[in-house]
Interface confidence: low
């Protein structure tokens, strides 16, 4: 039956381990409850509770049943798509490795211009290589209904997540309710702004309280936050209570009903609940499901503010009209005025095209690319001219009256607020991104991405710095591989070694500290893992009644 | 590379005021915090406060009252004013930088620090 | 104010020997703490932040333990240059606050 009908029997292993998933799930809350239902020796009348737990262990039996179940359907092992995948994938590493041994012994015989064309071919070929594994890689993420898992559990933890939230803003009682108040007012740019109030708003839910947004006379809209987003909470918007004070930590807190935020560089002393770590109880399904799990939580917070009022939705709906936004495309963020010479260094738009043509022909090996389409956000109102001269093949989408406002003397008014709204949609909307991470808008960009599709984790490419987010606790790898200098620049590594990333150069090097040693300098970006940060956030089960 | 140096009158009578100077190279008073210490001769240290990145001020709650710090960016100096000086405030004064590596991780680099005595 | 209390004023060791310096927070600091290591004369130089994680340059026979109360740094394959006096720091809330000095 397996080798009549592959298809039909790799959907049905992937339901089965679908299902096997969702019960191991249902099994870890039943025993979640079950324990805090358990009840004490002695005989005590507990009424309908004592009931109520044998029920919860009588279904706890059933489960554990049904998984030893699923768990013998299941050992037949993969599905024939994903080992005809896998077994490619090895291939292709072992003919990348032939084909470079090669041709990296014949570059050593050759000089002048015969060794240029030489190259030139070579690193044209090596890109073929590379996209031909990627592909397979793509496939491989998707076959045996990897793909279909993706989705579901991807949009399942987006809604618990998304429950939870609305749940800790929309407190039953107001008055009784604890508070955190967040003033928008931080003297920098809108993506600046926005990452502060997602920044109040992780050490709200991290301390159970709802967040209360502050933004009357709001530099970029005077009406404040509500006149462009819809309102934080619905029913509670009103910061009064019997006590206030200044965040002086959460024990310390805790008899505060309405604690004052300062901007996260003057926080102390600072709570766990902070980039880049994510809640313990989602980290294990995270991590499956999402290639950077911190940018997702951070995600979670950025949708749920920025949900627009309805006459910003039509704005959005009437832009991607006009400009002809379409599919394939993707998204250049060019950050040039007041950044340049202070944070970020100058990058002429050859840069960034690099990537965009290298992206377009992965692109091209799975799907028809009709056009190679590009939105082009800037704050630089003569790049598009430049762009469209010197790339005539590519279809250039950009509204330049949004670079004329994002410039520094217009800045801060309400019109600049719709275009740099319009440009983090848009870019966020796009296939790829390539940008400097330096840059708020492209990292906002970047994490509302990661709210449309179960893993966008790998859909970008930053000329500068990798993601980050500002006042972040530390950025930590685990070395997996044991690392000899070969250079003054390189510091040693041991596997399980701690190393405090700095930077990707994106070159094969990375920059950081070996915790270990207290040394910095480069190693090799392969030979080390993500460290992924678990804090013990509060779980709200009361929003899932 | 990352130096700080401070400049005291050396001398002060008691109850006067005392302004000392850190003048900072090697980094950036946006970036970084700045925090005060003493040392009286033979004993231990004093934290006084410190001026964040952003401007914001934080202060022992024991010498809030006759404690300012302040600075000024563009010229890389960063101030300390204490007033109604008495002679148990003679110390060493130091100045150090608030080290940020995710966490706050105290402080990484001081000044060689400038001696006061408080005496008529 | 949170009280770091070094319990040992002086301690005599031998070249090459290994020594521990102990600081007791008088309540949970987390892993807030820092080390200094100061000589006749000179500022304090920075040895240990986040309880066991070492500046950059500190040679890696400092080493610093512990969270919550105790904490200790231990100088292993001690030196003659080590011969100085040692502080620990919390800065879990304010005031920051340092040990006596041992």
């Known amino acids: 039956r397996d080798n009549d009908h592959p298809d039909h029997s790799s959907r049905e292993l992937s339901k089965i381990l679908a299902k096997l998933e969702r019960l191991k799930q249902q099994n870890e809350d039943l025993r979640r409850m079950a324990e805090s239902l358990r009840i004490p020796e002695g005989p005590i009348d507990q009424g309908p509770a004592i009931g109520r737990v044998r029920v919860l262990e009588e279904q706890l039996v059933k489960a554990k049943e049904q998984i030893e179940n699923y768990k013998k359907q299941t050992r037949n092992g993969l599905g024939k798509d994903h080992e005809i995948l896998r077994r490619r994938i090895e291939n292709g590493a072992k003919e990348l490795w032939f084909f470079l041994q090669s041709e990296l012994k014949k570059l050593k015989n050759l000089e002048g211009n015969e060794l240029q064309r030489h190259a030139d071919e070579f690193l044209l070929d090596l890109g073929h290589h590379e996209r031909s594994i990627m592909t397979d890689l793509y496939y491989l993420s998707q076959t045996d209904g990897a793909g279909d898992w993706r989705e579901k559990e991807a949009k399942d933890l987006t809604e618990l997540v998304q429950r939870r939230i609305t749940y800790l803003q929309n407190p039953k009682d107001c008055s009784k309710a604890k508070k955190l108040v967040c003033n928008i007012n931080k003297g920098c740019g809108y993506g600046c702004q926005l990452h502060h109030v997602v920044y109040c708003f992780m050490i709200a839910y991290g301390t159970q309280r709802t967040l209360i947004l502050e933004s009357q006379n709001w530099r970029y809209a005077t009406g404040g936050w509500e006149t462009v987003f819809r309102p934080v909470s619905e029913t509670c918007t009103d910061r009064s209570g019997i006590s206030t004070g200044h965040w002086s930590g959460e024990v310390k807190d805790k008899n505060v009903q309405v604690v004052e935020l300062p901007i996260v560089d003057s926080l102390h002393p600072r709570p766990p609940y902070l980039p880049l770590a994510v809640p313990e109880d989602l980290a294990d399904r995270l991590v499956r499901v999402h290639g950077d799990p911190a940018v997702w939580w951070v995600s979670q917070f950025v949708k749920y503010l920025i949900r627009p009022q309805p006459w910003l939705e039509k704005e959005i709906e009437e832009a991607t009209k006009k400009l002809g936004f379409k599919h394939p495309v993707i998204g250049v963020h060019v950050r040039r005025t007041d950044k340049v010479g202070t944070e970020a260094a100058f990058h002429p738009i050859e840069e960034y095209m690099v990537h965009v043509e290298e992206h377009f022909q992965l692109l091209a090996r799975r799907m028809q690319v009709d056009k190679k389409r590009v939105y082009l956000a800037t704050d630089d109102p003569s790049l598009l001219k430049e762009a469209k001269t010197k790339y005539p093949n590519y279809e250039f989408i950009s509204d330049n009256s949004i670079s004329w406002s994002a410039g520094l003397h217009n800045r801060y008014t309400e019109n600049s607020l719709r275009g740099v709204i319009l440009d983090i949609h848009f870019l966020s909307q796009a296939d790829f991104l390539v940008c400097t991470f330096s840059s708020q808008v492209c990292r906002v960009a970047y994490e509302i991405m990661q709210t449309l599709h179960p893993d966008a984790s790998a859909n970008f490419h930053s000329l500068d710095d990798i993601y980050y987010f500002g006042g972040q606790n530390a950025h930590n790898q685990i070395a997996i591989y044991a690392h000899q200098p070969r250079t003054a620049d390189e510091i040693p590594m041991e596997p399980g070694d701690i190393i405090g990333v700095a930077g990707n150069h994106w070159d094969g090097y990375s920059k950081g500290v070996n915790r270990k040693l207290g040394r910095t300098g480069l190693y090799p970006s392969y030979k080390v893992r993500e460290k992924i940060e678990t804090v013990k956030y509060p779980t709200y089960p009361e929003a899932e009644k | 590379q990352v130096q700080l140096k401070e400049s005291g009158p050396g001398l002060v009578a008691p109850s006067q005021s005392l302004s000392i100077t850190c003048t900072v190279s090697?980094?950036?008073?946006?970036?970084?915090?700045v925090n005060w210490v003493r040392q009286p001769p033979g004993k231990g240290l004093e934290w006084l406060g410190m001026i964040w990145g952003d401007g914001s001020t934080d202060y022992n709650s024991a010498l809030k009252s006759r404690l300012s710090i302040s600075k000024d960016n563009s010229k890389s100096q960063v101030f300390l004013k204490m007033n109604s000086l008495q002679t148990d405030d003679t110390a060493s004064y130091y100045c150090?930088?608030?080290?940020?590596?995710?966490?706050?991780?105290?402080?990484?680099?001081w000044g060689q620090g400038t001696s006061v005595t408080v005496s008529s | 104010d949170i009280v770091m209390t070094q319990s040992q004023k002086f301690m005599s060791t031998s070249l090459g020997d290994r020594v521990s310096v102990t600081c007791k927070a008088s309540?949970?600091?987390?892993?807030?703490v820092a080390w200094y290591q100061q000589k006749p004369g000179q500022s304090p130089k920075a040895l240990i932040y986040s309880a066991s994680y070492r500046y950059s340059g500190v040679p890696d026979r400092f080493a610093g333990s512990g969270s919550g109360t105790d904490f200790t740094l231990t100088i292993s394959n001690v030196q003659s240059e080590d011969l100085a006096e040692y502080f620990c720091?919390?800065?879990?809330?304010?005031?920051?606050?340092f040990g006596g000095g041992t």
């Open positions: 090697g980094f950036s008073l946006t970036g970084y915090g």
């Open positions: 309540q949970n600091v987390g892993s807030y």
């Open positions: 720091q919390q800065y879990y809330t304010y005031p920051y606050t």
């Open positions: 150090a930088r608030d080290f940020y590596d995710g966490y706050l991780y105290a402080m990484d680099y």
